[in-house]
């Protein structure tokens, strides 16, 4: 549940944060999951732990694997897993999908491209930016802090953007690159306050105890590509990830669809082996975009036994 994918290129720095959070005062121990061997904290090691961070300086392909972090508060231990994959450098310019960070959308009014994961590193400006492997030049491109701003965005600005920076650790420099796709929104499109298609507000769904059930949260946000459009489930007002019940899981990722030209997003909440206590929970479907947040609540009720009784003569 508390697992995070991280990736990097060989001979570059890679810094991974423990997926379990805590206070800065909490002790964090890191282990190789396979061997349970402790990862050293001494900075002279190529791979070392530094509080909530695990540092590969530089990374090697052989570092790939699962790492366990245990955040030790004075009274409770929280365990997380970092799934690290280190890839060989590509000889050609193509950046494979598995090395890409999340796609961002821009428009004439908003064309910020953030450099992914940069906040984990000790870097100094300026950032170098490349598009489809070509260094960006010209007054239209402005590298500002940890993001790139493109003036007067046009459709042909879409593409893969790579940021490159130097991480400094105790006087030694390590290169880091990160790539994400940038798409340009259709100016014909529009964004509006989210409309939740399902569930209906204050809906009640009948379920059978012991069976599995799925709840779909589906909302539309306007027409064309959306800069921000997200749907998610909450239980009693809490994020699913904060709810310590492994039977209840929100499916990874969100499915985008276009219905009559409208941009719609849906996500499914899967409840395995429905229990009595699940009927007491409040299930909120949340739809969020730049215009605001809309919430529809659904509750579960026990299916009336009369509905599926057999009649014997």
């Amino acid at each position: 549940k508390f697992s995070k994918q991280s990736w990097g290129l060989e001979n570059e720095a890679l810094i991974v944060r423990c997926p379990r959070q805590g206070k800065s005062s909490y002790i964090v121990d890191w282990y190789y999951s396979q061997t349970n061997k402790s990862i050293p904290t001494q900075e002279r090691n190529r791979v070392f732990a530094s509080g909530q961070l695990l540092k590969f300086l530089p990374a090697e392909v052989a570092d790939s694997g699962i790492y366990t972090c245990i955040v030790r508060s004075p009274t409770f231990n929280r365990t997380g897993y970092a799934n690290v994959t280190i890839y060989k450098k590509q000889p050609d310019c193509n950046v494979p999908d598995y090395l890409m960070y999340s796609t961002v959308s821009g428009s004439e009014k908003n064309s910020k491209i953030y450099c992914p994961t940069i906040d984990l590193y000790n870097w100094t400006a300026p950032l170098e930016w490349f598009k489809n492997c070509q260094a960006l030049q010209g007054s239209r491109y402005k590298a500002h802090k940890s993001f790139l701003v493109i003036d007067n965005v046009m459709t042909d600005d879409a593409g893969d953007y790579t940021c490159k920076f130097i991480h400094n650790e105790n006087g030694a420099n390590y290169s880091v690159t990160a790539t994400r796709s940038f798409t340009v929104k259709d100016e014909q499109g529009f964004s509006r306050f989210p409309v939740i298609r399902a569930p209906a507000h204050n809906e009640t769904k009948e379920v059978e105890i012991g069976e599995n059930t799925n709840l779909t949260c589906s909302a539309c946000f306007g027409k064309g590509a959306q800069f921000l459009a997200t749907v998610q489930w909450q239980l009693n007002g809490n994020k699913i990830t904060d709810f310590s019940e492994p039977r209840i899981q929100q499916e990874e990722g969100q499915n985008q669809s276009f219905s009559n030209g409208l941009a719609c997003v849906n996500t499914v909440l899967r409840i395995a082996d429905v229990k009595e206590e699940d009927l007491l929970l409040r299930y909120d479907c949340l739809a969020l975009n730049l215009h605001g947040l809309r919430r529809h609540t659904i509750r579960l009720s026990r299916k009336n036994p009369i509905d599926h009784q057999s009649t014997y003569c």
């Epitope: 959070q21 805590g22 206070k23 800065s24 005062s25 508060s73 004075p74 009274t75 929280r78 809490n238």
Partner: antibody
């Protein structure tokens, strides 16, 4: 600024269930490291820690009372709840909720308290 | 459970003098080189108010006449010079182990 306010039934009869609500503002219980706890104090006596709940829904209880207590939260409405089953006259006390903030684990802000009297 | 024993149970001090309250833990409250011991002040009809956290750190807004010291199992709260406004109950509290526990309290009075 940080404020916490407790609310409860005031009076209960023995064997009834106590339901307390802590409504807070000035911080979010979705912030890493944040917690909210419950403490009670019989009149003229000392303080007893009951339970607390963390940002990531980890719950911790006083083992002496664990079988009777349930703590929960509603992050979006900034509320924490405590239920105590089958109250007794010994549960008569002022109940406080308090925030666990700071770099270490301690109660840095307290509510004014709500008084519970258990009487038949 | 970690038992916290406060002494004295009550203390009468003249204005301007020093008041010292002790708190002894039944086992160490150290965590990663830090003592997880707090001190609270409680006036009648009011909730406790944090004075000192992790043994010796004075909470923001608390007058400098309050100070805390100690490590391991032995801790003390010092108030100097004592003022009229300091009349209250004082409690120590540990957060090293669950259950978090409080001392029995010390009542500070003015001579």
């Amino acid at each position: 600024q940080v404020t916490l306010k407790e609310s409860g039934p005031g009076i209960l009869q023995p064997s009834q269930t106590l339901s307390l609500t802590c409504s807070f503002s000035g911080f979010s219980l979705s912030t890493s490291g944040m917690g909210v706890g419950w403490i009670r104090q019989p009149s003229g006596k000392g303080l007893e820690w009951l339970a607390h709940i963390w940002w990531d829904d980890v719950k911790q209880y006083n083992p002496a009372l664990k079988s009777r207590l349930t703590i929960s939260k509603d992050t979006s409405s900034s509320q924490v709840f405590l239920k105590s089953a089958s109250v007794d006259t010994a549960d008569t006390a002022t109940y406080y909720c308090a925030r666990i903030g700071g770099d270490y684990d301690y109660f840095d802000f307290w509510g004014q308290g709500t008084t519970l009297t258990v009487s038949s | 459970d970690i038992v916290l024993t406060q002494s004295p149970a009550s203390l009468a001090v003249s204005l301007g003098q020093r008041a010292t309250i002790s708190c002894r833990a039944s086992e160490s409250v150290e965590y990663s080189g830090t003592s997880l011991m707090q001190w609270y002040q409680q006036k009648p009809g009011q909730p406790p108010k944090l004075l000192i956290y992790v043994a010796s750190n004075v909470e923001s807004g608390v007058p400098a006449r309050f100070s805390g010291s100690g490590s391991g199992t032995d801790f003390s709260l010092n108030i100097h010079p004592v003022e009229e406004d300091d009349i209250a109950m004082y409690f120590c509290q540990q957060s090293r182990k669950v259950p978090w526990t409080f001392g029995g309290g010390t009542k500070l009075e003015i001579k």
